[in-house]
Protein backbone atom coordinates (compact mmCIF):
# COMPACT_ATOMS: atom_id res chain seq x y z
CA UNK A 1 0.00 0.00 0.00
CA UNK A 2 1.68 3.24 -1.16
CA UNK A 3 1.17 6.98 -0.83
CA UNK A 4 0.22 7.00 -4.51
CA UNK A 5 -2.71 4.70 -3.80
CA UNK A 6 -3.95 6.96 -1.02
CA UNK A 7 -4.05 10.03 -3.27
CA UNK A 8 -4.13 8.90 -6.86
CA UNK A 9 -5.00 12.15 -8.59
CA UNK A 10 -3.25 14.46 -11.04
CA UNK A 11 -2.26 17.72 -9.30
CA UNK A 12 -1.87 19.64 -12.56
CA UNK A 13 -4.97 18.40 -14.39
CA UNK A 14 -8.31 17.57 -12.84
CA UNK A 15 -9.69 16.44 -16.21
CA UNK A 16 -8.03 13.04 -15.87
CA UNK A 17 -8.83 9.50 -14.82
CA UNK A 18 -6.17 8.09 -12.52
CA UNK A 19 -5.58 4.61 -11.12
CA UNK A 20 -2.78 3.17 -8.97
CA UNK A 21 -1.86 0.50 -11.50
CA UNK A 22 1.50 1.81 -12.64
CA UNK A 23 4.82 0.20 -11.67
CA UNK A 24 5.05 -0.36 -7.92
CA UNK A 25 1.47 0.83 -7.44
CA UNK A 26 2.32 4.29 -8.80
CA UNK A 27 -0.52 6.51 -9.92
CA UNK A 28 -1.08 6.51 -13.68
CA UNK A 29 -3.28 9.24 -15.15
CA UNK A 30 -4.95 9.55 -18.54
CA UNK A 31 -6.70 12.55 -20.04
CA UNK A 32 -10.46 12.44 -20.44
CA UNK A 33 -11.58 12.33 -24.05
CA UNK A 34 -8.29 11.09 -25.53
CA UNK A 35 -7.19 8.50 -22.97
CA UNK A 36 -3.63 9.74 -23.45
CA UNK A 37 -1.07 9.45 -20.67
CA UNK A 38 -0.58 12.68 -18.74
CA UNK A 39 2.57 13.86 -16.95
CA UNK A 40 1.22 15.17 -13.67
CA UNK A 41 4.46 16.95 -12.76
CA UNK A 42 3.86 19.62 -15.41
CA UNK A 43 1.09 21.34 -17.35
CA UNK A 44 -0.99 19.24 -19.74
CA UNK A 45 -1.00 20.37 -23.36
CA UNK A 46 -3.82 22.67 -24.44
CA UNK A 47 -4.88 20.19 -27.13
CA UNK A 48 -5.53 17.41 -24.62
CA UNK A 49 -7.27 19.86 -22.29
CA UNK A 50 -9.61 21.06 -25.04
CA UNK A 51 -10.34 17.47 -26.02
CA UNK A 52 -11.12 16.62 -22.39
CA UNK A 53 -13.31 19.69 -22.08
CA UNK A 54 -15.32 18.69 -25.14
CA UNK A 55 -15.78 15.16 -23.80
CA UNK A 56 -17.06 16.39 -20.44
CA UNK A 57 -20.77 16.96 -19.89
CA UNK A 58 -21.75 20.38 -21.34
CA UNK A 59 -21.55 22.70 -18.68
CA UNK A 60 3.47 57.62 -23.69
CA UNK A 61 2.11 54.57 -24.34
CA UNK A 62 3.73 51.57 -22.83
CA UNK A 63 0.95 49.26 -23.96
CA UNK A 64 1.61 47.05 -26.94
CA UNK A 65 -0.44 47.34 -30.09
CA UNK A 66 -0.97 43.84 -31.47
CA UNK A 67 0.59 43.47 -34.90
CA UNK A 68 -1.56 43.18 -38.01
CA UNK A 69 -0.76 39.47 -38.01
CA UNK A 70 -1.97 38.83 -34.45
CA UNK A 71 -4.68 36.22 -34.10
CA UNK A 72 -7.53 36.20 -31.61
CA UNK A 73 -9.37 32.96 -30.86
CA UNK A 74 -12.77 33.90 -32.30
CA UNK A 75 -13.84 30.35 -33.16
CA UNK A 76 -14.27 29.24 -29.55
CA UNK A 77 -14.33 25.62 -28.48
CA UNK A 78 -13.92 22.67 -30.82
CA UNK A 79 -12.96 19.02 -30.42
CA UNK A 80 -9.37 18.98 -31.68
CA UNK A 81 -7.20 16.25 -33.15
CA UNK A 82 -4.02 15.85 -31.12
CA UNK A 83 -0.84 14.07 -32.19
CA UNK A 84 0.74 11.26 -30.11
CA UNK A 85 2.63 13.83 -28.04
CA UNK A 86 -0.52 15.80 -27.28
CA UNK A 87 0.14 18.68 -29.66
CA UNK A 88 -2.43 20.05 -32.08
CA UNK A 89 -2.37 18.46 -35.52
CA UNK A 90 -1.75 21.16 -38.11
CA UNK A 91 -5.02 20.40 -39.88
CA UNK A 92 -8.29 20.28 -37.98
CA UNK A 93 -11.64 19.21 -39.41
CA UNK A 94 -15.16 19.08 -38.05
CA UNK A 95 -17.84 16.43 -38.51
CA UNK A 96 -19.05 18.06 -41.72
CA UNK A 97 -15.63 17.79 -43.43
CA UNK A 98 -14.86 21.48 -43.05
CA UNK A 99 -11.12 21.82 -42.44
CA UNK A 100 -8.69 24.57 -41.45
CA UNK A 101 -5.08 24.97 -40.37
CA UNK A 102 -4.15 25.88 -36.81
CA UNK A 103 -1.06 27.12 -35.01
CA UNK A 104 0.61 25.48 -32.01
CA UNK A 105 -2.03 26.90 -29.65
CA UNK A 106 -4.87 25.50 -31.76
CA UNK A 107 -6.10 28.83 -33.14
CA UNK A 108 -7.26 28.88 -36.76
CA UNK A 109 -4.76 30.59 -39.07
CA UNK A 110 -6.31 30.03 -42.50
CA UNK A 111 -9.70 30.28 -44.13
CA UNK A 112 -11.87 27.21 -43.76
CA UNK A 113 -11.79 24.73 -46.62
CA UNK A 114 -12.69 21.15 -47.43
CA UNK A 115 -10.85 17.85 -47.00
CA UNK A 116 -8.44 18.80 -49.80
CA UNK A 117 -6.97 21.60 -47.66
CA UNK A 118 -3.29 21.02 -46.90
CA UNK A 119 -1.51 22.18 -43.76
CA UNK A 120 2.13 21.32 -44.32
CA UNK A 121 3.43 22.03 -40.83
CA UNK A 122 2.31 23.06 -37.38
CA UNK A 123 3.29 26.73 -37.22
CA UNK A 124 4.63 27.77 -33.84
CA UNK A 125 3.05 30.61 -31.87
CA UNK A 126 6.15 32.34 -30.55
CA UNK A 127 4.64 35.49 -29.02
CA UNK A 128 1.51 35.72 -26.87
CA UNK A 129 0.08 38.99 -25.66
CA UNK A 130 -2.34 38.66 -22.73
CA UNK A 131 -4.38 41.83 -22.43
CA UNK A 132 -6.25 42.25 -19.13
CA UNK A 133 -8.45 44.95 -17.67
CA UNK A 134 -8.70 44.97 -13.89
CA UNK A 135 -11.68 46.13 -11.86
CA UNK A 136 -11.52 49.64 -10.41
CA UNK A 137 -9.34 50.00 -7.33
CA UNK A 138 -8.65 52.85 -4.91
CA UNK A 139 -5.48 53.68 -6.80
CA UNK A 140 -3.24 52.27 -9.49
CA UNK A 141 -1.08 49.29 -8.66
CA UNK A 142 2.62 49.90 -8.33
CA UNK A 143 4.05 48.77 -11.67
CA UNK A 144 7.12 47.00 -10.29
CA UNK A 145 5.04 45.18 -7.64
CA UNK A 146 2.55 44.10 -10.30
CA UNK A 147 5.37 42.99 -12.59
CA UNK A 148 6.97 40.93 -9.82
CA UNK A 149 3.70 39.30 -8.78
CA UNK A 150 2.75 38.25 -12.33
CA UNK A 151 6.23 36.90 -13.00
CA UNK A 152 6.08 34.94 -9.74
CA UNK A 153 2.68 33.55 -10.74
CA UNK A 154 3.91 32.27 -14.10
CA UNK A 155 7.06 30.84 -12.52
CA UNK A 156 5.48 29.12 -9.52
CA UNK A 157 1.94 28.21 -10.56
CA UNK A 158 2.51 27.46 -14.24
CA UNK A 159 6.19 26.42 -14.00
CA UNK A 160 7.09 28.69 -16.92
CA UNK A 161 10.77 29.61 -17.06
CA UNK A 162 11.15 33.34 -16.21
CA UNK A 163 13.03 34.03 -19.44
CA UNK A 164 9.79 33.41 -21.39
CA UNK A 165 7.94 36.25 -19.63
CA UNK A 166 9.26 39.02 -21.87
CA UNK A 167 7.47 41.99 -20.31
CA UNK A 168 4.64 43.18 -18.12
CA UNK A 169 3.09 46.51 -19.17
CA UNK A 170 0.66 48.53 -17.09
CA UNK A 171 -1.46 51.53 -17.88
CA UNK A 172 -4.38 51.55 -15.46
CA UNK A 173 -6.68 49.67 -15.80
CA UNK A 174 -4.96 47.69 -18.57
CA UNK A 175 -2.30 45.08 -17.90
CA UNK A 176 -0.43 43.33 -20.68
CA UNK A 177 1.72 40.25 -20.23
CA UNK A 178 4.04 39.34 -23.09
CA UNK A 179 5.19 35.75 -23.42
CA UNK A 180 7.87 34.91 -26.00
CA UNK A 181 9.29 31.51 -26.84
CA UNK A 182 10.94 30.65 -30.16
CA UNK A 183 11.35 27.06 -31.28
CA UNK A 184 15.10 27.32 -30.73
CA UNK A 185 14.64 28.60 -27.15
CA UNK A 186 12.32 25.83 -25.97
CA UNK A 187 14.30 23.02 -24.41
CA UNK A 188 13.01 19.55 -23.52
CA UNK A 189 10.95 19.82 -20.37
CA UNK A 190 10.18 23.52 -20.77
CA UNK A 191 6.53 24.48 -20.35
CA UNK A 192 5.07 25.83 -23.59
CA UNK A 193 3.90 29.45 -23.48
CA UNK A 194 0.64 28.39 -25.13
CA UNK A 195 -0.11 25.92 -22.36
CA UNK A 196 0.81 28.44 -19.64
CA UNK A 197 -1.42 31.08 -21.25
CA UNK A 198 -4.33 28.62 -21.44
CA UNK A 199 -4.01 27.63 -17.77
CA UNK A 200 -3.85 31.35 -16.88
CA UNK A 201 -6.91 32.10 -19.01
CA UNK A 202 -8.91 29.36 -17.29
CA UNK A 203 -7.71 30.52 -13.86
CA UNK A 204 -8.78 34.10 -14.60
CA UNK A 205 -12.23 32.81 -15.62
CA UNK A 206 -12.55 30.93 -12.33
CA UNK A 207 -12.24 27.56 -14.10
CA UNK A 208 -8.97 26.33 -12.63
CA UNK A 209 -7.55 23.17 -14.19
CA UNK A 210 -5.50 22.29 -11.12
CA UNK A 211 -6.71 19.46 -8.91
CA UNK A 212 -7.99 20.47 -5.50
CA UNK A 213 -6.27 23.84 -5.45
CA UNK A 214 -8.29 26.91 -4.62
CA UNK A 215 -9.03 29.31 -7.42
CA UNK A 216 -6.56 31.97 -8.41
CA UNK A 217 -6.20 34.61 -5.67
CA UNK A 218 -4.09 37.31 -7.26
CA UNK A 219 -2.90 40.01 -4.88
CA UNK A 220 -0.45 42.83 -5.30
CA UNK A 221 0.87 43.98 -1.91
CA UNK A 222 -2.24 42.49 -0.32
CA UNK A 223 -4.60 44.32 -2.69
CA UNK A 224 -6.82 41.93 -4.72
CA UNK A 225 -6.28 42.05 -8.47
CA UNK A 226 -9.65 41.23 -10.03
CA UNK A 227 -9.80 40.88 -13.79
CA UNK A 228 -12.97 41.89 -15.61
CA UNK A 229 -11.85 41.37 -19.21
CA UNK A 230 -9.26 39.22 -20.94
CA UNK A 231 -8.10 39.28 -24.56
CA UNK A 232 -5.31 37.07 -25.83
CA UNK A 233 -3.42 37.73 -29.06
CA UNK A 234 -1.29 35.06 -30.71
CA UNK A 235 1.61 35.80 -33.05
CA UNK A 236 2.99 33.00 -35.18
CA UNK A 237 6.51 32.51 -36.54
CA UNK A 238 4.93 32.53 -40.00
CA UNK A 239 2.10 35.06 -40.57
CA UNK A 240 -1.39 33.57 -41.03
CA UNK A 241 -2.97 33.14 -44.46
CA UNK A 242 -6.46 34.60 -44.67
CA UNK A 243 -8.20 35.82 -47.80
CA UNK A 244 -8.69 39.56 -48.33
CA UNK A 245 -12.45 39.04 -47.97
CA UNK A 246 -11.99 38.20 -44.29
CA UNK A 247 -9.56 41.04 -43.70
CA UNK A 248 -11.95 43.65 -45.08
CA UNK A 249 -15.10 42.20 -43.51
Amino acid sequence: HTAAQDNCTCPTNKMTVCSPDGPGGRCQCRALGSGMAVDCSTLTSKCLLLKARMSAPKNARTLVRPSEHALVDNDGLYDPDCDPEGRFKARQCNQTSVCWCVNSVGVRRTDKGDLSLRCDELVRTHHILIDLRHRPTAGAFNHSDLDAELRRLFRERYRLHPKFVAAVHYEQPTIQIELRQNTSQKAAGDVDIGDAAYYFERDIKGESLFQGRGGLDLRVRGEPLQVERTLIYYLDEIPPKFSMKRLTA
Epitope: A3, R26, C27, Q28, C29, D39, S41, P84
Partner: nanobody, 121 residues
Framework: QVQLQESGGGLVQPGGSLRLSCAAS????????MSWVRQAPGKGLEWVSY????????YYPDTVKGRFTISRDNSKNTLYLQMNSLRAEDTAVYRC??????????????WGQGTMVTVSS
Protein backbone atom coordinates in the same frame (compact mmCIF):
# COMPACT_ATOMS: atom_id res chain seq x y z
CA GLN B 1 13.75 13.65 -32.40
CA VAL B 2 12.88 10.66 -30.22
CA GLN B 3 12.66 7.44 -32.22
CA LEU B 4 11.78 3.97 -30.93
CA GLN B 5 11.72 1.01 -33.30
CA GLU B 6 10.47 -2.40 -32.14
CA SER B 7 11.15 -5.77 -33.75
CA GLY B 8 10.81 -9.48 -32.95
CA GLY B 9 7.05 -9.94 -32.98
CA GLY B 10 5.28 -12.74 -34.76
CA LEU B 11 3.00 -15.75 -34.47
CA VAL B 12 3.76 -18.17 -31.65
CA GLN B 13 1.95 -21.14 -30.13
CA PRO B 14 0.64 -21.05 -26.55
CA GLY B 15 3.46 -21.88 -24.15
CA GLY B 16 6.05 -20.59 -26.60
CA SER B 17 8.58 -17.77 -26.29
CA LEU B 18 9.53 -14.57 -28.11
CA ARG B 19 12.18 -11.91 -27.59
CA LEU B 20 11.32 -8.35 -28.56
CA SER B 21 13.90 -5.63 -29.18
CA CYS B 22 13.58 -1.86 -29.29
CA ALA B 23 16.24 0.35 -30.87
CA ALA B 24 16.23 3.86 -29.40
CA SER B 25 17.64 7.10 -30.78
CA UNK B 26 17.24 10.87 -30.49
CA UNK B 27 17.59 11.07 -26.70
CA UNK B 28 20.09 10.00 -24.00
CA UNK B 29 18.95 6.39 -23.68
CA UNK B 30 21.30 5.51 -20.83
CA UNK B 31 19.66 8.09 -18.54
CA UNK B 32 16.05 7.26 -19.48
CA UNK B 33 13.65 4.92 -17.73
CA MET B 34 11.90 2.63 -20.22
CA SER B 35 8.81 0.44 -20.39
CA TRP B 36 7.09 -2.06 -22.59
CA VAL B 37 3.37 -1.49 -23.07
CA ARG B 38 0.83 -3.43 -25.06
CA GLN B 39 -2.50 -2.81 -26.72
CA ALA B 40 -4.82 -5.74 -27.34
CA PRO B 41 -7.45 -5.37 -30.09
CA GLY B 42 -10.15 -2.97 -28.91
CA LYS B 43 -8.39 -2.30 -25.59
CA GLY B 44 -6.37 0.57 -24.14
CA LEU B 45 -2.62 0.65 -23.50
CA GLU B 46 -1.36 -1.31 -20.49
CA TRP B 47 2.20 -1.40 -19.26
CA VAL B 48 3.74 -4.86 -19.02
CA SER B 49 7.22 -4.07 -17.72
CA TYR B 50 9.37 -1.19 -16.54
CA UNK B 51 13.14 -0.79 -16.10
CA UNK B 52 15.05 2.16 -14.65
CA UNK B 53 17.93 3.87 -16.42
CA UNK B 54 20.76 1.69 -15.13
CA UNK B 55 18.75 -1.53 -15.18
CA UNK B 56 18.86 -2.05 -11.42
CA UNK B 57 15.09 -1.86 -10.84
CA UNK B 58 12.29 -3.58 -12.71
CA TYR B 59 8.53 -3.85 -12.23
CA TYR B 60 5.90 -6.13 -13.72
CA PRO B 61 2.11 -6.31 -13.31
CA ASP B 62 0.73 -9.57 -11.88
CA THR B 63 -0.55 -10.60 -15.32
CA VAL B 64 3.01 -11.19 -16.64
CA LYS B 65 5.13 -11.55 -13.50
CA GLY B 66 7.37 -14.63 -13.67
CA ARG B 67 6.84 -14.98 -17.43
CA PHE B 68 8.24 -11.72 -18.89
CA THR B 69 11.70 -10.23 -18.32
CA ILE B 70 12.73 -6.71 -19.31
CA SER B 71 16.40 -5.85 -19.85
CA ARG B 72 18.52 -3.24 -21.58
CA ASP B 73 21.92 -2.76 -23.17
CA ASN B 74 22.85 0.90 -22.78
CA SER B 75 25.96 0.48 -24.95
CA LYS B 76 23.67 -0.51 -27.84
CA ASN B 77 20.76 1.84 -27.00
CA THR B 78 18.49 -1.20 -27.02
CA LEU B 79 15.66 -2.41 -24.82
CA TYR B 80 14.55 -6.05 -24.69
CA LEU B 81 11.52 -8.05 -23.56
CA GLN B 82 11.85 -11.79 -23.13
CA MET B 83 8.39 -13.37 -23.13
CA ASN B 84 7.99 -16.98 -22.00
CA SER B 85 4.97 -19.23 -21.41
CA LEU B 86 2.90 -17.10 -23.75
CA ARG B 87 -0.90 -17.24 -23.55
CA ALA B 88 -3.66 -16.32 -25.97
CA GLU B 89 -4.45 -13.26 -23.82
CA ASP B 90 -0.93 -11.93 -24.48
CA THR B 91 -1.92 -11.28 -28.10
CA ALA B 92 -1.40 -7.54 -28.69
CA VAL B 93 0.71 -4.88 -30.33
CA TYR B 94 3.77 -4.42 -28.11
CA ARG B 95 5.37 -0.99 -27.99
CA CYS B 96 8.41 0.24 -26.15
CA UNK B 97 8.06 3.59 -24.42
CA UNK B 98 10.19 6.15 -22.71
CA UNK B 99 8.89 6.41 -19.17
CA UNK B 100 9.14 8.51 -16.04
CA UNK B 101 8.66 7.24 -12.51
CA UNK B 102 8.37 9.55 -9.48
CA UNK B 103 7.58 8.70 -5.86
CA UNK B 104 3.87 8.86 -6.64
CA UNK B 105 3.30 8.88 -10.41
CA UNK B 106 4.17 6.99 -13.58
CA UNK B 107 3.89 8.25 -17.14
CA UNK B 108 5.09 7.31 -20.62
CA UNK B 109 5.87 10.18 -22.98
CA UNK B 110 7.07 8.59 -26.24
CA TRP B 111 6.12 5.31 -27.86
CA GLY B 112 7.29 3.27 -30.81
CA GLN B 113 4.93 2.11 -33.56
CA GLY B 114 4.88 -1.38 -32.11
CA THR B 115 5.34 -4.99 -33.17
CA MET B 116 2.46 -7.48 -33.33
CA VAL B 117 2.54 -10.59 -31.14
CA THR B 118 -0.08 -13.23 -31.89
CA VAL B 119 -0.41 -16.27 -29.62
CA SER B 120 -2.50 -18.94 -31.30
CA SER B 121 -2.47 -22.63 -32.01
Amino acid sequence: QVQLQESGGGLVQPGGSLRLSCAASGFPFSSADMSWVRQAPGKGLEWVSYINADGSKTYYPDTVKGRFTISRDNSKNTLYLQMNSLRAEDTAVYRCARAKLTDTHYVEDYWGQGTMVTVSS
